[in-house]
């Protein structure tokens, strides 16, 4: 009996035309939503003038439907048993699942001022920037609509720069009509234990963002894992959102719509400093902001973002060191709301429910040459927003799963 089931599972989880796995893999049958909470800055003037703590108040959720587009350019390679594809990006605003509209206004850090002052270090350039920031009436903070903040806007200061700089900025710009990849993953035909594991990303086995093992592209994309998952396993996956591979460990047994699943979570150890977790040494890319690699819970992904000083963390700086959150007032981290988890059906290795949570922060530093940053007396890693991307298997699919997979075993 068990052998027959194993044989059937092995056959059905292969990523090729005609299998259950392939159909759901090309276009996810699950509705995936991305909820955003924006950190509205309450005291912009005090921060700019006196280098006060930044008082933030989260506003949200603002919800978008995402990952509804089918994979593109799906190409099988029979020679190395891989399948390559592009994952197109798309986001549709869901007013009924949101607290307001895309036209809602927020006071946030001026992305262009923070990024330009960090990247463009030449003295004369900084003088030019300063005069253009003043000329465009830009400041350390700005008021932007949700749509502008997420998807992009023409920045008035950058538009005046007399060089071919990028004048459109936004946290996820460009997004719609773009695609992530090319991914090349093993289809499992020759070896089911490699199914969905990424062979190459953008044609390479490494990212070129990190040193040593930190630069490796490990595991799957977290949508599925090779079948027959054990509780003792450490599940590796790559997330292009955070420009790195990461891992999840078993936490508990969960019953999802009558299907027994394993809940795997991202442990705090994955966000620890090299002092606590030596494996993380290569995620520490500089010594000043990281206080000689003793800070933890924030990841400098600037190398992955064209030099822009973007830092990724968990929402509300969950699992981050006190020095990171100390200059920010109004944060309340809690595991239940702010950690990432994957609910995996162990026989197939399919992720049937997940919650991916992360926070986007931007570094802003004092600058002698730039007037609006002149009064700052410290560096700030400023939270801009946090997001919760979730998906749960639908009732119909769950019924099918129960009857065809878990029901057969029990």
């Amino acid at each position: 009996g068990d052998l027959l089931i194993q044989k059937t599972i092995k056959k059905q989880v292969v990523l090729e035309e005609g299998t259950i796995a392939f159909k759901n893999w090309v276009k996810t049958g699950t509705e995936v939503y991305r909820q955003f909470w924006i950190f509205d800055v309450q005291n912009p003037q005090e921060v700019m003038m006196n280098s006060s703590n930044i008082q933030v108040k989260q506003r949200g959720p603002y919800t978008y439907r995402v990952r509804f587009l089918a994979k593109e350019n799906v190409t099988q390679d029979a020679e190395d048993n891989t399948v390559s594809f592009l994952q197109p990006n798309g986001a549709i605003f869901e007013p009924s699942l949101s607290v307001g509209t895309e036209a809602d206004n927020f006071t946030v850090l001026n992305l262009a001022v923070a990024a330009a002052s960090h990247i463009y270090q030449n003295q004369f350039v900084q003088m030019i920037l300063n005069s253009l920031i003043n000329k465009s009436k830009s400041s350390m903070f700005q008021v932007r609509t949700l749509r502008e903040l997420l998807w992009g806007y023409r920045d008035p200061f950058l538009s005046l720069v007399p060089y071919p700089v990028t004048t459109t900025v936004g946290l996820f710009y460009p997004y719609n009509n773009t695609a992530d990849g090319v991914y090349k993953v093993f289809n499992g035909k020759d070896n089911i234990s490699k199914v969905a594991i990424i062979d190459t990303y953008k044609g390479k086995r490494n990212l070129s963002y990190w040193e040593s093992h930190c630069d490796m592209i490990n595991g799957t994309d977290a949508a599925s894992f090779p079948p027959f998952v054990e509780k003792s396993q450490v599940l590796q996956f790559f997330s292009s959102d955070i420009c790195r591979s990461i891992y999840a460990v078993f936490e508990s047994d969960v019953n999802l719509k009558g299907i027994p699943v394993y809940r795997f979570v991202l442990p705090s150890k994955a966000f620890a400093s090299p002092v606590e977790n030596p494996d993380n040494y290569c995620f520490c890319t500089e010594k000043i902001i990281s206080k000689n690699c003793t800070s933890y819970g924030v990841l400098d992904i600037s190398k992955c973002k064209e030099g822009r000083p973007v830092y990724i963390s968990l929402p509300h700086f969950l699992y981050a060191s006190p020095d990171v959150s100390e200059p920010i007032d109004g944060l309340n981290p809690n595991e239940e709301e702010h950690r990432t988890y994957l609910d995996i059906e162990p026989i197939t290795g399919f992720t049937l429910q997940f919650a991916k949570r992360l926070q986007v922060n931007l570094l802003v530093k004092p600058s002698e040459k730039i007037q609006v940053l002149k009064n700052l007396k410290r560096n700030y890693i400023v939270p801009i927003l946090w997001l919760n991307e979730t998906g749960t298997i639908g009732d119909e699919k769950a019924n099918m799963f129960r009857s065809q997979v878990t029901g057969k075993i029990n």
């Epitope: 270090q121 030449n122 350039v125 030019i128």
Partner: nanobody, 120 residues
Framework: QVQLQESGGGLVQPGESLRLSCAAS????????MSWYRQTPGKERELVAA????????YYADSVKGRFTISRDDAKNTVYLQMNSLKPEDTAVYYC?????????????WGQGTQVTVSS
């Protein structure tokens, strides 16, 4: 590859003049802002004079205003610093700098420097 070669430095007496030249190669000169910096031992490099791409802004440090003039010849890929009424405090190594911005990148190049000594 990119090269910036300064020349024209030397020893002069207070009140005299010098003209520094910086010959550039290996990049599209007209797209770059050109600057002159100077440095004395133990001190930070100081921006003396700068000029944006043709027709753009010029800048002078307060200490040299009215005495120094920056100019550029895009046909010759050269930038000049005319230094009049030189003072002992102008003694320094003078460096030529070329910088431009593209996308989110800054391209910043330096010459090796030329020594200017003002002494009686």
């Amino acid at each position: 590859q990119v090269q910036l070669q300064e020349s024209g430095g030397g020893l002069v007496q207070p009140g005299e003049s010098l003209r520094l030249s910086c010959a550039a190669s290996g990049f599209t000169f007209s797209n770059y802002a050109m600057s002159w910096y100077r440095q004395t031992p133990g001190k930070e490099r100081e921006l003396v004079a700068a000029m944006q791409s043709t027709g753009g802004t010029t800048y002078y440090a307060d200490s040299v205003k009215g005495r120094f003039t920056i100019s550029r010849d895009d046909a010759k890929n050269t930038v000049y610093l005319q230094m009049n009424s030189l003072k002992p405090e102008d003694t320094a190594v003078y460096y030529c700098n070329a910088v431009t911005l593209q996308g989110w990148s800054e391209y910043d190049y330096w010459g090796q420097g030329t020594q200017v000594t003002v002494s009686s």
